[in-house]
């Protein structure tokens, strides 16, 4: 079994600053497409009183919006519920903070269950290094290799990032 | 579906510890994600741990971490959870449950098949 880095060990402040996505996967194609309600990107993170606070970007008429979402701490360890296109079970599922960050989120909208996960890095030059270690979370959380896309510098609304 | 079969239970005094085993009868068990519930006397069945099919991801409810250790043996089919530092509200029937299609932490409406139960009572 390869190291299980769940919880930053210093705490959920050591996830705060900037993030940028790499990649995502879901069971439903159509989430993660663009224009998908899941095809989001990270800008920032922060942390306060175990709750997870996050500036996504999220594409709208060729342009992209800054939104801010709060996932509210629960009583199981690295999960938080997250109130986004429905109900959203999040899982911090792999954490290095300095480096790589893979969510996983169970996504409950109409009576329709989804599973979506998001690979997010510090540094975008050493995005490739971490595609390993989330394709191997996907597989083992229920996703398939072939169920995930890896985002370009177009698909990142980087022209948004200040 | 898979057939899941709880062991490991009984009476142990306050700070001792305790190994259930949930062993797996049926699909290949490494398909499967695994939890553990419990359910005390007069409340609602209540997370305690979850593994991935590797064990990869792990959660645990805020009131177990740190003393409780949920781990699996794929080989064998059966997932454990070590018990230490036991106290009298950790009592209740300790249940394994398992899901074939994806990974549902602790939201017992994601696993599909449930073992039949293991009394562990912490009493001096």
């Known amino acids: 079994q390869e190291g299980n880095h769940e919880e930053p060990q210093g705490g959920l402040e050591e996830l705060s600053g900037r993030w940028h996505s790499v990649a995502l996967a879901s069971n439903k194609s159509d989430l993660i497409k663009p224009w998908g309600h899941f095809r989001v990107f990270i800008h920032s993170m922060s942390a306060k009183d175990g709750n997870l606070h996050g500036d996504i970007l999220i594409p709208q008429d060729g342009q992209c919006e800054k939104v801010s979402l709060t996932a509210f701490k629960t009583a199981t360890s690295n999960k938080f519920d997250l109130e986004y296109w429905g109900h959203n079970d999040l899982y911090l599922a792999e954490v290095d903070p300095k480096s790589y960050l893979i969510l996983y989120m169970i996504n409950q909208y109409n009576d329709d269950t989804s599973l979506v996960a998001h690979l997010m890095v510090r540094d975008l030059s050493r995005q490739q290094d971490f595609l390993p270690a989330f394709e191997s979370v996907c597989e083992d959380i229920g996703l398939h290799k072939d169920q995930i896309v890896v985002l370009s510098d177009d698909d990142r609304c980087q022209g948004s990032r200040d | 579906a898979v057939q899941l079969v709880d062991s490991g239970g009984g009476l142990v005094q306050p700070g001792g510890s305790l190994r259930l085993s949930c062993a797996a009868s049926?699909?290949?068990?490494?398909?499967?994600?695994m939890g553990w519930f419990r359910q005390a006397l007069g409340k609602e069945r209540e997370f305690v741990a979850a593994s991935s099919r590797t064990g990869r991801v792990t959660n645990y409810a805020d009131s177990v971490k740190g003393r409780f250790t949920i781990s699996r043996d794929n080989a064998k089919n059966t997932v454990y959870l070590q018990m230490n530092s036991l106290k009298p509200e950790d009592t209740a029937i300790y249940y394994c449950?398992?899901?074939?299609?994806?990974?549902?932490?602790?939201?017992?409406?994601?696993?599909?098949?449930w073992g039949q139960g293991t009394q562990v009572t912490v009493s001096s």
């Open positions: 049926g699909r290949t068990f490494s398909y499967y994600a």
């Open positions: 449950a398992a899901d074939d299609r994806f990974y549902g932490g602790d939201n017992p409406a994601f696993y599909n098949s």
